[in-house]
């Protein structure tokens, strides 16, 4: 392993995932590494073999239990070293005493659906996935609306400061397709992240009603 | 504002010892990692020792590992540096240095870190 600039980044889903990604410039593609948890109170140890996602970059996923169990908690600490092997030894490549509950990064909202549909609005719901049950109402949302001849980029983001799994968007355009999404963060921890973006949901409004003859 | 105040250092002859302190404020203390370093008089900055936010991963410098031991208490938001069997090469202006994130990367210890302190004087001297 080359001495390049390294990047070493995990977040925990709330519930039974830890994602990390480990980045260095001047690695070898081929050079093996893993990420290596160690609990202060757990009796399990876990290690997850680091994937190329890109040309110096590497993911895994510590998986430490059925997806909906509550495996870690807000008093955890979790040891996470990435180890890169160097001929017949390991070597130590970044440490951290990883506090879960203050890198959350929570699985993308899921189930969105078009609950109600006219000509000038739209009520849309979703559902997040595998949240913990700690964090009761203490969660946050965005939304953005792609409309045509528009980039995601481009669209403005919709704030929500509660925990609110539906939102009636208004002053759209009658007969149009549009593409919706939404993304969630937990107001805990001090390098929490937002969720990734939904998959987008695709809706059209209704046409205008045709005006009468005089 | 963070800030790091360190504190510890003194005259002490060879073969002596000395604990350095490091008081920190304005931030969460145990989220981050913590490192010391130091500057021997005419030469540049060298990596010490360097303790993740829980002080449940450490790692020193080869000059230094077995006489010094870097720890630190929570609560009270407190890095230290016991050094023990001090040599001539140890006189130095040391300084504690709060890394940027929880993390710290033992290849290239020096590198990540945000926040430094005055520093704190240690001559070793007959």
């Known amino acids: 392993a080359v001495n390049g600039t390294s990047q070493f980044t995990c977040f925990y889903n709330s519930r039974a995932n830890i994602s990390c990604v480990w980045s260095q410039d001047g690695a070898l593609q081929d050079t093996s590494c893993q990420v290596h948890a160690w609990p202060d109170r757990r009796r399990w140890n876990q290690t997850c073999e680091l994937l190329p996602v890109s040309q110096a970059s590497w993911a895994c996923n510590l998986i430490l239990g059925a997806p909906d169990s509550q495996k870690l908690t807000t008093v955890d600490i979790v040891t996470l070293r990435v180890l890169c092997r160097e001929g017949v030894r390991w070597r130590v490549m970044a440490i951290q005493d990883f506090k879960p509950f203050e890198n959350l990064r929570l699985m993308a909202p899921i189930s969105l659906q078009v609950v109600h549909v006219e000509t000038h609005r739209c009520n849309i719901s979703w559902e997040i996935s595998q949240a913990s049950h700690y964090f009761e109402r203490h969660l946050e949302f965005e939304a953005r609306t792609l409309s045509p001849g528009h980039t995601w980029e481009e669209a403005p983001l919709l704030t929500l400061k509660q925990k609110q799994e539906w939102i009636c968007l208004e002053t759209l355009t009658p007969d149009t397709q549009y593409e919706f999404q939404v993304r969630v963060k937990p107001l805990q921890g001090e390098f929490t992240t937002w969720s990734p973006w939904s998959q987008p949901l695709a809706f059209r409004t209704k046409p205008a009603a045709l005006g009468k003859d005089t | 504002q963070v800030q790091l105040v360190e504190s510890g250092g003194g005259l002490v002859q060879p073969g002596g010892s000395l604990r350095l302190s490091c008081a920190a404020s304005?931030?969460?203390?145990?989220?981050?990692?913590m490192t010391w370093v130091r500057q021997a008089p005419g030469k540049g900055l060298e990596w010490v020792s360097s303790?993740?936010?829980?002080?449940?991963?450490?790692h020193y410098a080869d000059s230094v590992k077995g006489r010094f031991t870097i720890s630190r208490d929570n609560a009270k938001n407190t890095l230290y540096l016991q050094v023990n069997s001090l040599k001539p090469e140890d006189t130095a202006v040391y300084y504690c240095?709060?890394?940027?994130?929880?993390?710290?990367?033992?290849?290239?210890?020096?590198?990540?870190?945000?926040?430094r302190g005055q520093g704190t004087q240690v001559t070793v001297s007959s």
């Open positions: 304005g931030f969460t203390f145990d989220n981050y990692a």
């Open positions: 303790i993740t936010g829980a002080g449940r991963g450490t």
């Open positions: 240095a709060r890394y940027s994130s929880s993390t710290y990367y033992p290849t290239t210890p020096v590198r990540g870190t945000d926040y």
